[in-house]
Amino acid sequence: ECVTQLLKDTCFEGGDITTVFTPSAKYCQVVCTYHPRCLLFTFTAESPSEDPTRWFTCVLKDSVTETLPRVNRTAAISGYSFKQCSHQISACNKDIYVDLDMKGINYNSSVAKSAQECQERCTDDVHCHFFTYATRQFPSLEHRNICLLKHTQTGTPTRITKLDKVVSGFSLKSCALSNLACIRDIFPNTVFADSNIDSVMAPDAFVCGRICTHHPGCLFFTFFSQEWPKESQRNLCLLKTSESGLPSTRIKKSKALSGFSLQSCRHSIPVFCHSSFYHDTDFLGEELDIVAAKSHEACQKLCTNAVRCQFFTYTPAQASCNEGKGKCYLKLSSNGSPTKILHGRGGISGYTLRLCKMDNECTTKIKPRIVGGTASVRGEWPWQVTLHTTSPTQRHLCGGSIIGNQWILTAAHCFYGVESPKILRVYSGILNQSEIKEDTSFFGVQEIIIHDQYKMAESGYDIALLKLETTVNYTDSQRPICLPSKGDRNVIYTDCWVTGWGYRKLRDKIQNTLQKAKIPLVTNEECQKRYRGHKITHKMICAGYREGGKDACKGDSGGPLSCKHNEVWHLVGITSWGEGCAQRERPGVYTNVVEYVDWILEKTQAV
């Protein structure tokens, strides 16, 4: 059962796993949710009736019955982990805590103009978990405007104390706001020879990598596969760190694989969920339950639905035994990983899928692409919206993309002559324009934010944000697309699609059904050759076939150029301009979204 509300002046008795320090009960709940075993917690707020050394303690608890006896205690706030809930969960914490000093290892001290600058510095520093900033009102003159970057073994403070005129906060890496590069490759036959901070058992290098990403201190990892010569180290996942943040050296070793934490690009691929099945593999751990199940898929469902289950092993039924049902062993451990992995015993193993909801919304798997044909199907491009104007009559004006629950990204040139946001309507989850009737629900537009350097599409800065009057509830047919990460500037996208209801040729009309076309990206040098009269800047990106024939056209403006990379769709471009439509050697020109990520974040996060 999902219980989201916090219980004031209430303490859960017993079941203690560990104690951490958090600046609020709300964040204590998040820490509990991400902890492999925590189901309940008790947080102690600051209070004159409490011993100050107990302020801000967050006691993580577990219980076989999923609940514990409640005791009245002033200043105690208790609650349940979100593991029991089905809604989206995020470790992202943008809160700034006034007059709190979050203690940790102070490894970097520098002057910053503001707490926001200090937080950005923390977010862009590979080691930083949280920071404390001394404001300009801080009593000690030499400490004013000092930004202290901190880290700890757990990623949470070792203690929190009251301190006037300072503010503290967390790194925003888990909010996908880091500018650190992210290295997604896994390097075969490679051992990274740096400090091990922890080790766990994992069935493959991908799971090892996801565990590393989830671990506060892990920057890179080495995994020894099941063919590794030393038996005691098989399936061992070594979580590593170094002072520079990168491996100091690498050693070539057969049957070892190494890679990097994806903490800086957490939004770009799902990281918490291990959805594969491992055949002829047994996961050992503390047994929670043994249940009969028809298949390994059914066993995984049982594990996912049992809140304490972390992983499972399914042993298929022997012929004509137990109505064809096998045994499903539901298991757990102190760290969420098997204590040992054995091969060759015939079991099928896997992990709970309850961690999937901790992925970012934009990474959620969408319907597979329909190969061939130009008409889309429902749910194929769930971030695509149709922007209508109601003046003088209602019509499709431009495309746009959902990038947040209150934000649409589109092109600035769409708003030529649009005097007020009141005449705009955003329709999401639409396949056919004919679906839009008088009573079709839409999102009103609260604000149009056009880039202040925009003059005309051809000169760049053709980008605009629409702030919606109400929030979008994400469903299969309406959900956001990931923004490209600034650390991914070197990515070469090979699977890019332009979508929209625009014209199919220059003299045409708006299409009823959402159209799609797969279009290759063109280098800016090549694009510049095709548009000698224009300046193709690095803030633009071009796409099109040399022979023409497929392109965006009138009415597609503002819509997405969506590129799939590592199974995740990224909003690489915004349809902007071009010479004619689908003309030979005249690629379409798109706003290069990665160059505007800072601008987007600045505008969408403004209070």
């Epitope: 590069a181 997604r184 075969p188 036959n189």
Partner: antibody
């Protein structure tokens, strides 16, 4: 097939920074299967590895040169570059760029299989 | 750093001779060793990788063997185009290091 071409000034003054670029043609630098390396050879001497870079930006340097070396990659231009600061006459050498195969397609194929023709750099005032 | 010691530093041989060059690593490198051929004024050319695997396009008269610390490059029947300098290289651990080279000269 893949070809590498070094470019940069042949003469550098002492204490200045040596800058070389290697352009990759006939294939993409954007591949997890390769590191892109710089090697130098002093006149009449053996080969000395300077460092390597992966398209992702991951770099490894020779510790003897680490404080002075920067290797970078530009996937959009299909190039990688070498910068060696505070040069002296001891840095006079032929500089090669090379492709270092790192487990191409899982067949454990390794080694520097493609080299540039080399560019002679003289450090002199 | 791993030191790679090649011997001999030079060898004089005739066409048709069998030539053996050895390379010793200062510590075990499994089979992470390559052999290169370099002719004057030219870039090195990869002959052997993973101690014994022949690079495609390289004549079969070249072979490599060894594992751990001791490695050998053998040219079974020396041809006129084989007169060059040969280098071994370890890539077991960074920094990558080369041997000092063995010059194969005409007798």
């Amino acid at each position: 097939q893949v070809q590498l071409q070094e470019s940069g000034p042949g003469l550098v003054k002492p204490s200045q920074t040596l800058s070389l670029t290697c352009t990759v043609s006939g294939g993409s630098i954007y591949s997890g299967a390769y590191y892109w390396s710089w090697i130098r050879q002093h006149p009449g001497k053996g080969l000395e590895w300077i460092g390597s870079i992966h398209y992702s930006g991951l770099t490894y340097y020779n510790p003897s040169l680490k404080s002075r070396v920067t290797i970078s990659v530009d996937t959009s231009k299909n190039q990688f570059s070498l910068k060696l600061s505070s040069v002296t006459a001891a840095d006079t050498a032929v500089y090669y760029c090379a492709r270092d195969v790192d487990d191409s397609s899982g067949d454990e194929h390794y080694g520097m299989d493609v080299w540039g023709q080399g560019t002679t750099v003289t450090v002199s005032s | 750093d791993i030191q790679m010691t090649q011997s001999p530093s030079s060898v004089s041989a005739s066409v048709g001779d069998r030539v053996t060059i050895t390379c010793r690593a200062s510590q075990g490198i499994d089979s992470w060793l390559a052999w290169y051929q370099q002719k004057p004024g030219k870039a090195p050319k990869l002959l052997i990788y993973a101690a014994s695997s022949l690079q495609s396009g390289v004549p079969s008269r070249f072979s490599g063997s060894g594992s751990g610390t001791d490695f050998t490059l053998t040219i079974s029947s020396l041809q006129p185009e084989d007169f060059a300098t040969y280098y071994c290289q370890q890539y077991h651990i960074v920094p990558i290091t080369f041997g000092g080279g063995t010059k194969v000269e005409i007798k």
